[in-house]
Amino acid sequence: MLSHTGPSRFALFLLCSMETLLSSHMAPTHQLPPSDVRKIILELQPLSRGLLEDYQKKETGVPESNRTLLLCLTSDSQPPRLNSSAILPYFRAIRPLSDKNIIDKIIEQLDKLKFQHEPETEISVPADTFECKSFILTILQQFSACLESVFKSLNSGPQ
């Protein structure tokens, strides 16, 4: 379950990204094909949904923030790809405050979709507890929607 006990550092700025080396047999960095990206998205979807549903159950009545926009898709590629560079520090930051098991699995998948040497920009979340909860909810909702969008693009005909 997600909870938030005070200010932490999170990431929002999203950069174009792809994959990391896993082994000597794996394709070099940024070179995973759409088929493998689709596999990773399929792994991420239930993790993201579960995290969001748990948070919504725990934090009932928290509204979505209208000041947070997760620009999670690349605009310079077809099909659009997931930008993970700024999502990663967000999940790294909430890890101590959340379900570490789920967060670790999400981080593991996002790492595979990240440029090897891409910097991870950090931003401050609102200090106000209620605004923090709203910020987290918005990120989780938009992340889930982003995954759905990428998955649909990978399913819609030739890559």
Epitope: H25, P34, E43
Partner: antibody
């Protein structure tokens, strides 16, 4: 060394369900992607689908309405079920491992021949 | 689906000579300069065996007589020199896009 072994009935009647088991040794099915492929009598190979290390499945759209891949991690086995079979499903069925992103299917079972006939 | 067309369907080569098998994809299987095309050998009564991954990388334990080349839509498997043990059917396979697909196979025989 990684080894895969298919097992199941060699004869299935039309409209029935084809059920096969892939037993894996030398690796855990809780890592990598575990696939089913079949080879028709005319030598054509068809990719059927996979079950992932986490239990996520994905299927060839041409089979989606009939196929199910499941697993039993305690036995290190995964399974293929193909419903409503016809004579067109007569083939040799292989299980195979896809171990790393960007790589290829590096370990295959020896295959099991299945005939669909009444 | 990406269609892979192999040619020739069968090939007879003298021992010690070169065998060349072609695989053409209906669309590019490249991303960021990597080609997601692989080659398998299947001997009679056996399962497919990985020879070449990502167009040109020799799988561990495979003799250097086997080689792969090509990019985008056109790929080649070369066996030089051919040995008696190479009698088999050879398949190309793409893992660029779902569903993964295979070529129709090329049967290699000794002349």
């Amino acid at each position: 060394e990684v080894q895969l072994q298919e097992s199941g009935p060699s004869l299935v009647k039309p409209s029935q369900t084809l059920s096969l088991t892939c037993s894996v040794t030398g690796d855990s099915i809780t890592s990598g992607y575990w696939n089913w492929i079949r080879k028709f009598p005319g030598n054509k190979l068809e990719y059927m689908g996979y079950i992932s290390y986490s239990g996520i499945t994905d299927y060839n759209p041409s089979l989606k309405s009939r196929i199910s891949i499941t697993r039993d991690t305690s036995k290190n086995q995964y399974y293929l079920q193909l419903n409503s079979v016809t004579t067109e499903d007569t083939a040799t069925y292989y299980c195979a491992r896809y171990g790393n992103y960007g790589y290829a299917m590096d370990y295959w079972g020896q295959g099991t021949s299945v005939t669909v006939s009444s | 689906d990406i269609v892979l067309t192999q040619s020739p369907a069968s090939l007879a080569v003298s021992l010690g000579q070169r065998a060349t098998i072609s695989c053409r994809a209906s669309e590019s299987v490249d991303t960021y300069g990597n080609s997601f095309m692989h080659w398998y050998q299947q001997k009679s009564g056996q399962s497919p065996k990985l020879l070449i991954y990502r167009a040109s990388n020799l799988e561990s334990g495979i003799p250097a007589r086997f080689g792969g080349s090509g990019s985008r839509t056109d790929f080649t498997l070369t066996i030089d020199p051919v040995e008696a043990d190479d009698v088999a059917t050879y398949y190309c396979q793409q893992s660029y896009e779902d569903p993964w697909t295979f070529g129709g196979g090329t049967k290699l025989e000794i002349k």
